[in-house]
């Protein structure tokens, strides 16, 4: 048992937040400031990511985990771990190779990122358009045209309100 343990890599005992220091006879040393090790048994600590410029700190670096960044207002994250910040557009627009462009008629975008999407086609579900779409909003589909035939009400009227202890007049 002793022989097996002596053959074992002494660095494997170093926990996250430390590194196996070859300069100090392979003892476990804490990661220096602004560095981290997220797993045990590491021979070096990694440098913490710095969130600068357009990048804001979402989570501070610790001895066991890297910093996490997001984007300043007016931009949104792209890529793994927010490696880039893409410019926002206004609602009703999409970002093209030439910049922010208004959504074409029949399409909408209700966010500051992403692409313009076609309005819902209400007739595919046998419904009618209750509220027209805009560049910023999808159409609102209502009941089917058959439900709106003369004499038919599309909305059930509410029951008359009664106060407790009073009979209807």
């Amino acid at each position: 048992f002793e022989r097996t343990r002596s053959l074992q890599d002494p660095c494997s005992n170093c926990p996250a937040g430390t590194f196996c220091d070859n300069n100090r006879n392979q003892i476990c040393s804490p990661c220096p400031p602004n560095s981290f090790s997220s797993a045990g048994g590491q021979r070096t600590c990694d440098i913490c990511r710095q969130c600068k410029g357009v990048f804001r700190t979402r989570k501070e670096c610790s001895s066991t985990s890297n910093a996490e960044c997001d984007c300043t207002p007016g931009f949104h994250c792209l890529g793994a771990g927010c490696s880039m910040c893409e410019q926002d557009c206004k609602q009703g627009q999409e970002l093209t190779k030439k910049g922010c462009k208004d959504c074409c008629f029949g399409t909408f975008n209700d966010q500051k990122r992403g692409i313009c999407r076609p309005w819902t086609n209400c007739s595919l579900d046998g419904k009618s358009v209750l509220v027209n779409g805009t560049k910023e909003r999808d159409v609102v589909c209502g009941p089917s045209p058959a439900d709106l035939s003369p004499g038919a009400s599309s909305v059930t009227p509410p029951a008359p309100a009664r106060e407790p202890g009073h009979s209807p007049q």
């Epitope: 410029g53 007016g74 792209l78 490696s83 893409e86 410019q87 190779k97």
Partner: nanobody
Framework: QVQLVESGGGLVQPGGSLRLSCSAS????????MSWVRQAPGKGLEWVSD????????FYEDSVKGRFTISRDNAKNTLYLQMNSLKPEDTAVYYC?????????????????WGQGTQVTVSS
């Protein structure tokens, strides 16, 4: 092909000013964010400033805030760095760099094109 050519560097006394220029060609300049990065003698690359494609959003390294101003002229395909109140620690080679995606600001290790650099020396 993409080309970035810096100019405007030189020797200046502490407290003095310089204006760096970066002339861009070979891509649609007005669609890309641009940066200034510097490398002091014996040191690694240090991000200095970013400007978005339209020029309305600018960002600075803390040590240059209030002293340096990044700007761009999309009609002239040129990026600028106005450097005021220069200090000896601003001595470095200054590079302009292009970001990889349209209307997007990336981290320094993702920049896809760099100029050859211009030397700025601040000394009395």
């Amino acid at each position: 092909q993409v080309q970035l050519v810096e100019s405007g560097g030189g020797l200046v006394q502490p407290g003095g000013s310089l204006r760096l220029s970066c002339s861009a060609s070979g891509f649609t300049f007005s669609s890309y964010a641009m940066s200034w990065v510097r490398q002091a003698p014996g040191k690694g690359l240090e991000w200095v400033s970013d400007i978005n494609s339209g020029g309305e959003s600018t960002f600075y390294e803390d040590s240059v805030k209030g002293r340096f101003t990044i700007s761009r002229d999309n009609a002239k395909n040129t990026l600028y760095l106005q450097m005021n109140s220069l200090k000896p620690e601003d001595t470095a080679v200054y590079y302009c760099a292009k970001h990889p995606l349209t209307f997007t600001i990336a981290t320094m290790n993702d920049y896809d094109y760099w100029g050859q650099g211009t030397q700025v020396t601040v000394s009395s």
